[in-house]
Amino acid sequence: QQAPYWTHPQRMEKKLHAVPAGNTVKFRCPAAGNPTPTIRWLKDGQAFHGENRIGGIRLRHQHWSLVMESVVPSDRGTYTCLVENAVGSIRYNYLLDVLERSPHRPILQAGLPANTTAVVGSDVELLCKVYSDAQPHIQWLKHIVINGSSFGADGFPYVQVLKTADINSSEVEVLYLRNVSAEDAGEYTCLAGNSIGLSYQSAWLTVLPEEDPTWTAAAPEARYTD
């Protein structure tokens, strides 16, 4: 039996990582031991799973690594890898500093909102995750049809505002659709704006009838696809 030890300490010499906002950061703590140790990560001394982070994190245990894409100022802090087995434990601290960029248009997380399929009567949540260093406002829009047309004479779509708020109010990034009906099907857009400009991404909601036999075979109430 052997306590954990670093297998490539030379790869861990860079303790301070100062990176521009928007870049990807990778921390590695390659280790070994007997029995094979486990690795977990802390941020500023607290267990870190990335659930509150836009874009989440990637933990690759076989590579002893933590990856964060599109870092933002709130990602700043001390990241600790804690490697342990039954015999002992070792830890190492990385310091992350995120260098703020110039104010830019809002950046929306790729793939959100996601195309969604739901059954009549079910509830749907459409998510929109926004990064903006200037305070953004968000609007949820539904694309609608007027006189049989989705577009006006100017070539722009007809839209209906479903929800408007500033990002710092609660749940602004989620559009809740309760008890959906066939009329709720269609294209939904998350529009984020700040003092520099606007950005938006759209998704389609497909609503299936309750008695659809192909649907009942596929268990979940709401299905999310990219």
Partner: antibody
């Protein structure tokens, strides 16, 4: 008709102050970010500052930071630029420009409407 | 800051002939939403700039279809398919992706 009308320009000595105003009409002013852009005589265009639709966010070019202050009064549909510690190199035509609005961008999301400009001359 | 470099400095064109203006940015203007935030303006003598093209290739309302914008990421082009006398002026490209917003140095278009 959508219009922006600047005023307040004039001749001023270096180190002095001047306040520019921009009166907006024909659109919902309180729903749009607003910018100032300037152009020195015979030169190109230089962005100066922006203010968000509600005035909560303001950003400045490095060349004016700490000297110029952008503000707005949504109840009066006016945009202002307070210019302190003026320098000879601040001599330019100052344009008021409409920025991004709230809601679906039916066309460009800003920088589509410019005022006629007001001339500021800083000279001893 | 993003630097916008425009060429040529000036252009003398025969009426009815095409004209092309190039603009290069020091960083990509392709945003995560898939749009490329380069704008083109013309400034005629004694007037403020007028928007011609937005988001790389969209013609602003009222702009004749002889004007077109193209390019990708860092290299952009404004083309006038057949120059007319009224097209005389200084043409500017602008990046509208982050502050400070920056403009190209301008291209003066004259008629031969």
């Amino acid at each position: 008709e959508v219009q922006l009308l600047e005023s307040g320009g004039g001749v001023v000595q270096p180190g002095r102050s001047l306040r520019l105003s921009c009166a907006a009409s024909g659109f919902t002013f309180s729903s749009y970010a607003m910018h100032w852009v300037r152009q020195a005589p015979g030169k190109g265009l230089e962005w100066v500052a922006v203010i968000s639709y509600d005035g909560s966010n303001k950003y400045y070019a490095d060349s004016v930071k700490g000297r110029f202050t952008i503000s707005r009064d949504n109840s009066k549909n006016t945009l202002s630029l307070q210019m302190n510690s003026l320098r000879v190199e601040d001599t330019a035509i100052y344009y008021c420009v409409r920025g991004a609005g709230l809601g679906w961008p039916y066309g460009p999301d800003g920088f589509d409407i410019w005022g006629q400009g007001t001339m500021v001359t800083v000279s001893s | 800051d993003i630097v916008m470099t425009q060429t040529p400095l000036s252009l003398s064109v025969t009426p009815g002939q095409p004209a092309s203006i190039s603009c290069k940015s020091s960083r990509s203007l392709l945003h995560s939403d898939g749009k490329t935030y380069v704008y083109w303006y013309v400034q005629k003598s004694g007037q403020p700039p007028q928007l011609l093209i937005y988001e790389l290739s969209n013609r602003f309302s009222g702009v004749p279809d002889r004007f077109s914008g193209s390019g990708s990421r860092t290299d952009f082009t404004l083309k006038i398919s057949r120059v007319e006398a009224e097209d005389v002026g200084v043409y500017y490209c602008m990046q509208y992706i982050e502050a400070p917003l920056t403009f190209g140095g301008g291209t003066k278009v004259e008629i031969k």
